[in-house]
């Protein structure tokens, strides 16, 4: 009825779109909640994190696990009181990810 | 005064973290701005975006030119009329990008 | 320390051209974007645009779009600013401005520009 | 463009008073970010400007406590606590929000 090809190449389409943990890219201070005084160079770092579509609009694509790992950067605070530090952070990199339904929120929260 | 070995790693970090196109994952329908009763098989597809970060913190990672590409997908209307019907869909690739700030909105608009 | 040496006083001919420089030491210098800022009469601040050292994009107020051309050489860690068609409302005090992840931080000293026939 | 319209242009102040300027622009500074990237400089006699607030709040490296700053949405502004003879010189607030960047016309911080 469809031609066979089409149907490989939707189906690896699909495939690829699947949630999964893709490489993205995280701003370091938002994700530790640093102050404004503190920043880092580069401001940004790349790791894995949960992504990608689920086949029911009722799912959400959340990590199952989770390694942590570190990055090494210059942690810079204003007012400088010295030279920019390089420090190791440590940031959650997603190893496994699934289509979960979002838990219902607490009628009294 | 700092390893040569970990500026380097430190800098190659900080190139993978910046703004270009990255391969995302879009939901065809809510792309296409298309009515609740229309969906498709598979829900979403892989294309390019921009993504990524800037070295200011009021920039903006952003598309400077686009692509269309096709993607061969089911369309599915609700109630079933007919059978799934595979069609060409035309989704934005985003193949260049540029941290750029923000213009201020004109006070009339 | 961050430091942004800039190139001497500048007196020229109106019509000609004149390229500044701005050396920068201190800090990485591909790591941030270079602004520069027109100040006249000891008073008013103008923001001319910025080129990014890494790729060297550039981003000009539409004001000065047809006066300044902004250059970097990364070998030098050194950002140029060349101005065109010099008229006497040229004269002026032009910064170069290191931008930090939150604001433009650090300010060369400044050179002074003077349109005179 | 954003207008930035800095109050008063000439603030007279005796040494340990407290002087307070005021910058009101034409616009929302905030960003889409939810930032708002209002900065405040001071350029002493003679020399270049020197970056002293950052993002309404936020002293910069070596500024002294006495400097504060607050603010939100179009109105800003710029508190000196204790005024002291190394404070004197022209002030300007800058927004870094929306391009192009732009300045208040500066405020002459002088003995009275």
């Known amino acids: 009825f469809y031609d066979i090809e089409t149907l490989k190449v939707i189906d690896e389409e699909w495939q690829r779109t699947q949630c999964s943990p893709r490489e993205t890219c995280v701003e370091v201070a938002s994700e530790l909640g640093k102050s404004t005084n503190t920043f880092f160079k580069p401001p940004c770092v790349n790791v894995f994190r949960c992504g990608g579509c689920c086949n029911e609009e009722s799912l959400i694509c959340m990590n199952t696990s989770t390694s942590y790992i570190s990055k090494q950067l210059f942690e810079i605070s204003v007012p400088l009181t010295s030279v920019p530090e390089l420090v190791p952070v440590k940031v959650a990199n997603h190893t496994g990810c699934k289509c979960l339904p979002t838990a219902p929120r607490h009628p009294y929260s | 005064f700092y390893d040569i070995e970990t500026l380097k790693v430190i800098d190659e970090e900080w190139q993978r973290t910046q703004c270009s196109p990255r391969e995302t994952c879009v939901e065809v329908a809510s792309e296409l701005g298309k009515s609740t009763n229309t969906f498709f098989k598979p829900p979403c597809v892989n294309v390019f975006r921009c993504g990524g970060c800037c070295n200011e913190e009021s920039l903006i990672c952003m598309n400077t030119s686009t692509s269309y590409i096709s993607k061969q997908l089911f369309e599915i209307s609700v109630p079933l009329t007919s059978v799934p019907e595979l069609v060409p869909v035309k989704v934005a690739n985003h193949t260049g990008c540029k941290c750029l700030p923000t213009a201020p909105r004109h006070p009339y608009s | 320390e961050v430091q942004l040496q800039q190139s001497g006083p500048e007196l020229v001919k109106p019509g000609a051209s004149v390229k500044m420089s701005c050396k920068a030491s201190?800090?990485?210098?591909?790591?941030?974007?270079m602004h520069w800022v027109k100040q006249s009469h000891g008073r008013s601040l103008e923001w001319i645009g910025y080129?990014?050292?890494?790729?060297?994009?550039?981003y000009y107020n539409q004001k000065f779009r047809d006066k300044a051309t902004l250059t970097v050489d990364k070998s030098s860690s050194t950002a140029y600013m060349q101005l065109n068609s010099l008229t006497s409302e040229d004269s002026a005090l032009y910064y170069c401005?290191?931008?930090?992840?939150?604001?433009?931080?650090?300010w060369g000293q400044g050179t002074s520009v003077t349109v005179s026939s | 463009d954003i207008v930035m319209t800095q109050t008063p242009l000439s603030l007279p102040v005796s040494l340990g008073d407290q002087a307070s300027i005021s910058c009101r622009s034409s616009q929302s500074l905030v960003h889409i970010n939810g930032n708002t990237y209002l900065h405040w400089y001071l350029q002493k006699p003679g020399q270049s400007p020197k970056l002293l607030i950052y993002?309404?709040?936020n002293r910069f490296s070596g500024v002294p406590d006495r400097f504060s700053g607050s603010g939100s949405g179009t109105d800003f502004t710029l508190k000196i606590s204790r005024v002291e003879a190394e404070d004197l010189g022209v002030y300007f607030c800058?927004?870094?929000?929306?391009?192009?960047?732009?300045f208040g016309g500066g405020t002459k911080l002088e003995i009275n």
């Open positions: 080129i990014d050292p890494y790729n060297g994009d550039t």
């Open positions: 201190g800090y990485s210098f591909t790591g941030y974007n």
């Open positions: 993002k309404v709040s």
């Open positions: 800058s927004q870094g929000t929306h391009v192009p960047r732009t």
């Open positions: 401005i290191r931008a930090g992840y939150y604001a433009m931080d650090y």
